[in-house]
Amino acid sequence: SGTTNTVAAYNLTWKSTNFKTILEWEPKPVNQVYTVQISDRSRNWKYKCTGTTDTECDLTDEIVKDVNWTYEARVLSYPAGNVESTGSAGEPLYENSPEFTPYLETNLGQPTIQSFEQVGTKVNVTVEDERTLVRRNNTFLSLRDVFGKDLIYTLYYWKSSSSGKKTAKTNTNEFLIDVDKGENYCFSVQAVIPSRTVNRKSTDSPVECMGQEKGEFRE
């Protein structure tokens, strides 16, 4: 059932990275508009992106309230210029999204190597602790704040002069590795959530090499 010339949304997809979360759908609207509803923790439906002609809606503000909650959204279709109009059954056409649990499903963004510092034959490599839009006590939490020890960084490193790689891991944001004196090394990191079965790993960070800006050398 539904209003004449109004089509239901389809292909509802959550796109989420480091908790920045957007619901996307199809089709591009023709003579219709969309409104999104998302279920809160009380199972009430909250209206978002009312009367939009976009095919996406940023739901970050809602999902960061509790990243462990399992959310459901739906996209309502209305004739253009009449957001109150309903279908023959007294309701607008709508389509439900898949369920979405931010903690388990948000993609890990590409990490960044913040700095590296060499002291003798040791190098300290620091990964930037990216800020998320998740809040606690009016403060934005970092990725490490949210995931704690459930976030591991894997470091790949190799001599600039050779192809043989080594790896190390940390459940903090710092690595302390042994290097050969007088050799330049390159570094790349990857984030991993060990407890997950999908969306476990980020893409690799950009490669950073010693002898470039980010590093510091001390005897």
Epitope: I152, T154, K165, T167, A168, K169, Q190, P194, R200, K201
Partner: antibody, heavy 117, light 107 residues
């Protein structure tokens, strides 16, 4: 359920090559790091190396670098170990294992390789 | 490279005994240490991860402790089914290294 099944082992002459396979089911290998470990008869476990199948990054114990090559075919959900210039001391049971980053949580049953003339 | 020294290489104990195995790393491995049990002809089985955490489905008589370079694996009350070889594994940095193994027998 998660399963790893190795194959390709057997008897091979010194100096020859052998390619072992590890077929995964119940998960996508590209979501994990994957390892090869071996065990010579009556001896302990020995780590060979790992691959991140998603980006092809490989890490080896230096003693195997250059002679052994780990690769993966994500479309077939299969891990490989190419072993070249085999020696009698490479005689062992070869295991593949899945790594969740805190531990190796699943292992194959192992495939035996005998290097002998 | 990090060396793992596991001791003893073998030990004999009675049912009900408390059994302890140690692994010493040549440098700080920051608790990235696992303990595995292996029975003849079988693949290793995870018992303890991150030095102290008990793997799912593993009886509570198994435990792990330690940090830095020194780690201990304990069976609080040895059972007949615990007859196996036990290995530690450090995976904090490559090359990953196993201890030499401890073969446990019942007297």
């Amino acid at each position: 359920q998660v399963q790893l099944v190795e194959s390709g082992g057997g008897v091979v002459q010194p100096g020859r090559s052998l390619r072992l396979s590890c077929k995964a089911s119940g998960f996508n290998i590209k979501d994990y790091y994957m390892h090869w470990v071996r065990q010579a008869p009556g001896k302990g476990l020995e780590w060979i190396g790992l691959i991140d199948p998603e980006n092809g990054n490989t890490i080896y114990d230096p003693k195997f670098q250059g002679r052994f090559t780990i690769s993966a075919d994500n479309s077939k959900n299969t891990l490989f170990l190419q072993m070249d210039s085999l020696r009698p001391e490479d005689t062992a049971v070869y295991y593949c294992a899945r790594d969740n980053s805190y531990y190796f949580d699943y292992w194959g049953q192992g495939t035996p390789v005998t290097v002998s003339s | 490279d990090i060396q793992m020294t596991q001791s003893p290489s073998s030990l004999s104990a009675s049912v009900g005994d408390r059994v302890t195995i140690t692994c010493k790393a040549s440098q700080d491995i920051r608790k990235y240490l696992n303990w595995y049990q292996q029975k003849p002809g079988k693949a290793p089985k995870l018992l303890i991860y991150y030095a102290t955490s008990l793997a799912d489905g593993v009886p509570s008589r198994f435990s792990g402790s330690g940090s830095g370079t020194d780690y201990t694996f304990t069976i609080s009350s040895l059972q007949p089914e615990d007859i196996a070889t036990y290995y530690c594994l450090q995976h904090g940095e490559s090359p990953y290294t196993f201890g030499q193994g401890t073969k446990l027998e019942i007297t």
